[in-house]
Interface confidence: medium
């Protein structure tokens, strides 16, 4: 079972050879698509392999912003031929996430396909880390294999790479150890429950609240930490602000996402942006725990 | 295994002409763009003109640029380039080369043009 | 046109010695630097593109490093066969311009 994502490629090619991306779609080059075309094939160590973030079977829904759906296949090639000149192109790639059925706890083995010189897409940070922890996961780029494997998520504990124990080994090795992997890359990770924004732990709840602007501030403050795995806590809100005015939203409150972005991995600084840039509907994922019985 | 062989070198007389050829053999000619590099006795690298898969684009050094023309014919994996006009600064030993996406990675023998009076 | 230059435009140096050679472009070329090795009477090889990519069938110990304008070439442990001439080549845009060389020599 699969689910699909879009995401934003930029690729940087050359105007003789071009991003190593082949499109198809349609049977005659002139004829109207009536859907998006599909990557075709993939040159080897290309920009578009290199990239680690697009693969054969992917649906190109736009070209540098022009929708491909309603244009032909020649103009999807031009488009392309186009930016080649320039040296870059914007994707707008669909593509399709696998549905995995994983535990919330405990320690499994994942495999991913790894090709010299393409990304895996595993961010990994030492962030605040004691000697003897594990290193954790810190980021899933969008796109990669490892993100599109459906079981990996920012907050698990790396523990092992192709069987090499990551107990005391530095970060910069571990980052080098999954650089130099060929073929087939087995990562063993353990998830925490801790680690789970989903799960509803003994005495908490979260929720979604939608909040429309309609040009006005929000009435939030939110505080937190530069380390990825702090919480993200609402500190203070406007009296009879619109935040506050929902009776939804109260101080000490954690958000989990703003507009379906996780801020699971994030730090202070990326949930203060992605409040900037949320647009006039602002959706809040919010847990909020419960008072205990003393 | 890819190869490259250049052929058609040779001493020509300034104002002349010559056109070299460049056989490729080992790999799908038509889907790598190719150029030309030029190396003066005792000198340095010096890139010549460049052509696409498919022949539709071509680029030029300023120093050949209206004297050289690269061309390719993808039926019988040959590269080109006509050398009109020839002086002196053009004596040189030609490389042919397949450019992919990040370098040139595949070189020819190179042969020589003496271009001299 | 981009100018590519090197330095140093020779060298002297033993078996076993650490060596870097750097290339700065004359405008920013992202990572659209190649390095390739020549021996006389020999055509170029690549050793190096995308400024830090190993070409297949390199020896290990040639790397690369840099982006914008400014690159290095690092050799850790010279091999006698290491001995030639180095050049750095931006594939950023036409003309494809080289750097003046870097002849290595046995010191």
């Known amino acids: 079972i699969v689910h699909t994502e879009t995401t934003e490629v930029v690729l940087c090619g050359d105007p003789l050879s071009g991003f190593g991306l082949q499109l198809q779609g349609g049977i005659f080059a002139t004829e109207t698509l009536s859907s998006p075309p599909l990557v075709c094939f993939i040159e080897p160590d290309s920009p578009a392999e290199r990239c680690g973030l697009l693969q054969v079977g992917d649906r190109v829904l736009s070209i540098n912003g022009i929708a491909t759906e309603d244009g032909t296949m020649e103009e999807a090639n031009q488009l392309l031929r186009d930016a080649a000149l320039a040296h870059k192109v914007v994707l707008e790639v669909e593509f399709d996430v696998a549905e995995s059925v994983i535990p919330s706890s405990g320690t499994f083995h994942v495999k991913l396909p790894k090709k010299r010189s393409v990304e895996l897409g595993i961010t990994i940070s030492s962030a605040s880390r004691k000697r003897g922890e594990p290193l954790i996961i810190s980021d899933i780029k969008k796109g990669s294999v490892a993100h599109r494997t459906g079981t990996l998520e920012p907050g698990d504990k790396l523990l092992a790479i192709d069987n090499i124990r990551l107990d005391n080994c530095p970060m910069e090795d571990a980052v080098q150890i999954l650089r130099q992997c060929e073929d087939l890359v087995k990562l063993k990770i353990r998830k925490d429950e801790d680690n789970s924004d989903e799960l509803e732990t003994t005495g908490a709840v979260s929720y979604t609240v939608e909040l429309k602007r309609y040009g006005g501030p929000l009435g939030i403050t939110i505080s937190g930490t530069e380390e990825p795995f702090d919480p993200i806590v609402i500190s203070g809100l406007t009296k009879r602000g619109l935040a506050e005015r929902t009776g939804a939203i109260h101080v000490g409150d954690r958000i989990l996402a703003i507009n379906n972005v996780s801020l699971k991995g994030r730090p202070l600084s990326e949930a203060i942006h992605l409040l900037q840039v949320a647009g006039e509907t602002v959706t809040l994922k919010i847990k909020k725990q419960l008072d205990r019985p003393l | 295994e890819v190869q490259l062989l250049e052929s058609g070198g040779g001493l020509v007389q300034p104002g002349g002409s010559l056109r070299l050829s460049c056989a490729a053999s080992?790999?799908?000619?038509?889907?790598?763009?190719m150029s030309w590099v030029r190396q003066a006795p005792g000198k340095g690298l010096e890139w010549v003109s460049a052509?696409?898969?498919?022949?539709?684009?071509?680029y030029y050094a300023d120093s050949v640029k209206g004297r050289f023309t690269i061309s390719r014919d993808n039926s019988k994996n040959t590269l080109y380039l006509q050398m009109n006009s020839l002086r002196a600064e053009d004596t040189a030993v030609y490389y042919c080369?397949?450019?992919?996406?990040?370098?040139?990675?595949?070189w020819g023998q190179g042969t020589l043009v003496t271009v001299s009076s | 046109d981009i100018q590519m230059t090197q330095s140093p435009s020779s060298l002297s140096a033993s078996v076993g010695d650490r060596v870097t050679i750097t290339c700065r472009a004359s405008q920013s070329i992202s990572s659209y630097l190649n390095w390739y090795q020549q021996k006389p009477g020999k055509a170029p090889k690549l050793l190096i593109y995308a400024a830090s990519s190993l070409q297949s069938g390199v020896p290990s110990r040639f790397s690369g490093s840099g982006s914008g304008t400014d690159f290095t070439l690092t050799i850790s442990s010279l091999q006698p066969e290491d001995f030639a001439t180095y050049y750095c080549?931006?594939?950023?845009?036409?003309?494809?311009?080289f750097g003046q060389g870097t002849k290595l020599e046995i010191k």
């Open positions: 052509i696409s898969g498919s022949g539709g684009s071509t």
């Open positions: 080549q931006q594939s950023y845009s036409t003309p494809y311009t």
């Open positions: 080992g790999f799908t000619f038509s889907s790598y763009a």
């Open positions: 080369a397949r450019i992919h996406f990040y370098g040139l990675d595949y």
